[in-house]
């Protein structure tokens, strides 16, 4: 969490972002909230990123004043603009792509005075990991599969029963380059497996970490997988 | 200590070409936007062209647009401008400035001693 | 584009007075306003930024005011090392104008 203080005469007005991450090819939000103003039309909101000229998006008198913003931006970014008289500046970045990572301004005018904070915007690609018994195999097998995901992440085996276990030995994890070229299906196998015992599969890069869980009795096969973004910290 | 060093310049006839260099030193040259400005003889200060840190974005005044060329070469430290079709109305001497802050939102805080261009015939 | 309008243009004064440069926009520029200082012959100095900021080894009798469309500079006691053209300059749109300049001779 980044809060930022501006000073306009004496004035000044607190802006908060939060450091968040984008996933390729998907829309993503830039946070931000400020303190309200109660006239729509004296709210100036500014977005700026560190190395590009032009603005990210400006919205100012209740609507968006696009005339300039920077080319790399057009006609993929929008304020919430029936929030912003609560005091949400937060930004809607669609088509999300690997060059918008980097810093991020949102700078804040109202008839309170300014205020400004940064935030960090990571980019890259997750997605959550499916664990399932592979049959075809000669021996207990589990298959972790996870269709999109960049830069390359690291994957770790657990197991519930051999807590601690290093599972490197008995594992074997591919990743394959997808069409769009930039990211990779990631393929994790697991050997030897033994019955009534949950394993984890765990993907993490420096953006996520997505976990699949796989229990597998005699009698049926449970599954569950979450995914968790890192380092989102407010200023 | 941070600098900037223009060269490049000369006499050159209508219709003619000349490439300026601005050689950067003393800071991290990738990370600042710089930009070309023009003073012609007596006369005032005309922004002339713009380029991103990464080189990725470029903007030029509308009086130069399709003629100048700007880039930097991360690489050499340097900033470029490739000026084509040259009018006796481009003469003036030409500074290189680096952009202060990081959102291009401030001045130019490093100028060049500037480079003299003389378009005649 | 966006126009930058400096007055007066030029003007005469001693040392010791108080000097007023305005600066106006055609449309607003927020704060993003920079003014510089160029003697003859050297290259333009940046005094303000963000149109109230000294930068860097500027006096502080260099002070800058204004948002939105007007702008101030105002030098409080001029010394001799002051007498030179200043400029206005906007960065809120990607032209980058600048003002046609003020001269500050001595009176």
């Known amino acids: 969490l980044i809060i930022g203080f501006g000073i306009s005469g004496r004035h000044s007005i607190t802006v908060t972002t939060v450091a968040s991450a984008g996933n390729i090819g998907e829309d993503g939000i830039l946070s931000c909230t400020f303190e309200p103003d109660i006239k729509l039309s004296d709210i100036v909101i500014q977005w700026l990123k560190e190395g590009v000229l032009g603005l990210v998006h400006e919205f100012k008198e209740g609507k968006d004043e696009l005339s300039e913003q920077d080319e790399m931006f057009r006609g993929r970014t929008a304020v919430f603009a029936d929030q912003v008289i609560v005091g949400n500046a937060s930004l809607r970045l669609k088509n999300v792509q690997l060059t918008d990572a980097g810093t991020y301004k949102c700078y804040i005018i109202t008839s309170k005075g300014k205020g400004n904070a940064n935030l960090e915007y990571k980019t890259g690609a997750f997605s959550m990991p499916e664990v399932n018994v592979d049959y075809n195999a000669s021996s207990e097998t589990l298959r972790c599969e996870a269709p999109r995901w960049f830069p390359q992440p690291t994957v770790v085996w657990a197991s519930q029963v051999d807590q601690g276990a290093n599972f490197s030995e008995v594992s074997n994890t591919s990743f394959e380059l997808n069409s769009e070229n930039v990211t990779m299906k990631v393929v994790s196998v697991l050997y030897n497996v033994t019955i009534n015992n949950t394993y984890s599969c765990m993907i993490e890069n420096d953006i996520a970490k997505a976990t699949g869980d796989i229990k597998v009795t005699e009698s049926e096969i449970k599954r569950r997988s979450h995914l968790q973004l890192l380092n989102s910290k407010a200023s | 200590e941070v600098q900037l060093l223009e060269s490049g310049g000369g006499l050159v006839q209508p219709g003619g070409s000349l490439r300026l260099s601005c050689a950067a030193s003393?800071?991290?040259?990738?990370?600042?936007?710089m930009h070309w400005v023009r003073q012609a003889p007596g006369k005032g200060l005309e922004w002339v062209s713009a380029?991103?840190?990464?080189?990725?974005?470029?903007y030029y005044a509308d009086s130069v647009k399709g003629r100048f060329t700007i880039s930097r070469d991360i690489s050499k430290n340097t900033l470029y401008l490739q000026m084509n079709s040259l009018r006796a109305e481009d003469t003036a001497v030409y500074y290189c400035?680096?952009?202060?802050?990081?959102?291009?939102?401030?001045?130019?805080?490093?100028w060049g001693q500037g480079t003299t261009v003389t378009v005649s015939s | 584009d966006i126009q930058m309008t400096q007055s007066p243009s030029s003007l005469s004064a001693s040392v010791g007075d108080r000097v007023t440069i305005t600066c106006r926009a055609s449309?607003?520029?927020?704060?993003?306003l920079a003014w510089y200082q160029q003697k003859p012959g050297k290259a333009p100095k940046l005094l303000i930024y963000?149109?109230?900021n000294l930068a860097t080894g500027v006096p502080s009798r260099f002070s800058g005011s204004g948002s939105g469309t007007d702008f101030t500079l105002t030098i409080s006691s001029l010394q001799p090392e002051d007498f030179a053209t200043y400029y206005c300059?906007?960065?809120?749109?990607?032209?980058?104008?600048f003002g046609g300049g003020t001269k500050v001779e001595i009176k």
């Open positions: 400035a680096r952009l202060l802050g990081r959102f291009g939102e401030y001045g130019m805080d490093v």
């Open positions: 380029i991103s840190g990464s080189g990725g974005s470029t």
């Open positions: 963000d149109a109230t």
């Open positions: 449309q607003t520029v927020y704060t993003w």
């Open positions: 300059q906007q960065s809120y749109s990607t032209s980058w104008t």
């Open positions: 003393g800071f991290t040259f990738n990370t600042h936007a």
